[in-house]
Interface confidence: medium
Amino acid sequence: CKAMHVAQPAVVLASSRGIASFVCEYASPGKATEVRVTVLRQADSQVTEVCAATYMMGNELTFLDDSICTGTSSGNQVNLTIQGLRAMDTGLYICKVELMYPPPYYLGIGNGTQIYVIDPEPCPDSDF
């Protein structure tokens, strides 16, 4: 396959509600009509797939119903949002982009976005 450059932010801090958003941008060498975006999580040298979506250019990304990811696309940028994150989910989240159609097939893998998740402090007990 052919290589393609993918850029993503180095660090993102999740919100107190466990939501993290980042942009994944790819340098498309041609006029792709079908693109697949996959988010991978690397932690302790293990890589697992978090979510994936295939979309037609100009259309919305469609993740599976039970996915923790949502996203929108604009040109060669994909805005990804990961929800339901907890402190244990802190790790390097890698954006992988594949230009599926038309040929040739291009593959690009970003350097990863370190997402930090801090669990909110529980509210102190109150007698009131």
Epitope: C1, E34, M56, E98, M100, Y101, P102, P103, P104
Partner: antibody, heavy 121, light 107 residues
């Protein structure tokens, strides 16, 4: 046995329409991209159009863009080519061909299985 | 679009001869090239894919080589059934494009 059988060819006046069909058998049809390739009398091979495994993406040669439409019905193991606004230069033998692609649509190795063709005049 | 220039357009050879056909791409296509044989009234048959990989069932006298823009099909010892027209096809980028063809005739 892996087989592709084309039909639907015939004689048509300039400006007319025709719909070609290709029936596939002997392989899992929706694992493969498909193409139409034509050959004018006494001439070489010309790729006309291609479609990916699920019909979601298509491609066309400049010579037919806007006039021809490729489609497929995976439930019927069939490929189609709707040809509108036909011209004299579209006269050819039209072959249906299977794309030798890895993992449905990641990488293409050209066409490995061909039908005998149907004639459009 | 990628243009494929095939040469020669025709050649005469005898049984047992070594035959070489070349194909030149207008831009680099890595090894994304196939070779096809076509006999009159028949569908094309793939001989070589990915520039040098032999299609299953094809005799080993057929071989392919090259990468980038220059490619070669070689028939090491021409047999009577090899008299046909040969085409190269780039399968790197849409639209797929074929060479003009090389007709191999009996001398």
């Amino acid at each position: 046995e892996v087989q592709l059988v084309e039909s639907g060819g015939g004689v048509v006046r300039p400006g007319g329409s025709l719909r070609l069909s290709c029936a596939a058998s002997g392989f899992t049809f929706d694992d493969y991209g498909m193409s139409w390739v034509r050959q004018a009398p006494g001439k070489g091979l010309e790729w006309v159009s291609g479609i990916n495994w699920n019909g979601g993406s298509t491609g066309y040669a400049d010579s037919v863009k806007g006039r021809f439409t490729i489609s497929r019905d995976n439930a019927k193991n069939s490929l189609y080519l709707q040809m509108n606004s036909l011209r004299a230069e579209d006269t050819a033998l039209y072959h249906c061909a299977r794309e030798d692609n890895w993992r449905k649509y990641y990488y293409y190795y050209g066409m490995d299985v061909w039908g005998q063709g149907t004639t459009v005049t | 679009d990628i243009q494929m220039t095939q040469s020669p357009s025709s050649l005469s050879a005898s049984v047992g001869d070594r035959v070489t056909i070349t194909c030149r791409a207008s831009q680099g296509i890595r090894n994304d090239l196939g070779w096809y044989q076509q006999k009159p009234g028949k569908a094309p048959k793939r001989l070589i894919y990915a520039a040098s990989s032999l299609q299953s069932g094809v005799p080993s006298r057929f071989s392919g080589s090259g990468s980038g823009t220059e490619f070669t099909l070689t028939i090491s010892s021409l047999q009577p059934e090899d008299f046909a027209t040969y085409y190269c096809l780039q399968h790197n980028s849409y639209p797929w494009t074929f060479g003009q063809g090389t007709k191999v005739e009996i001398k």
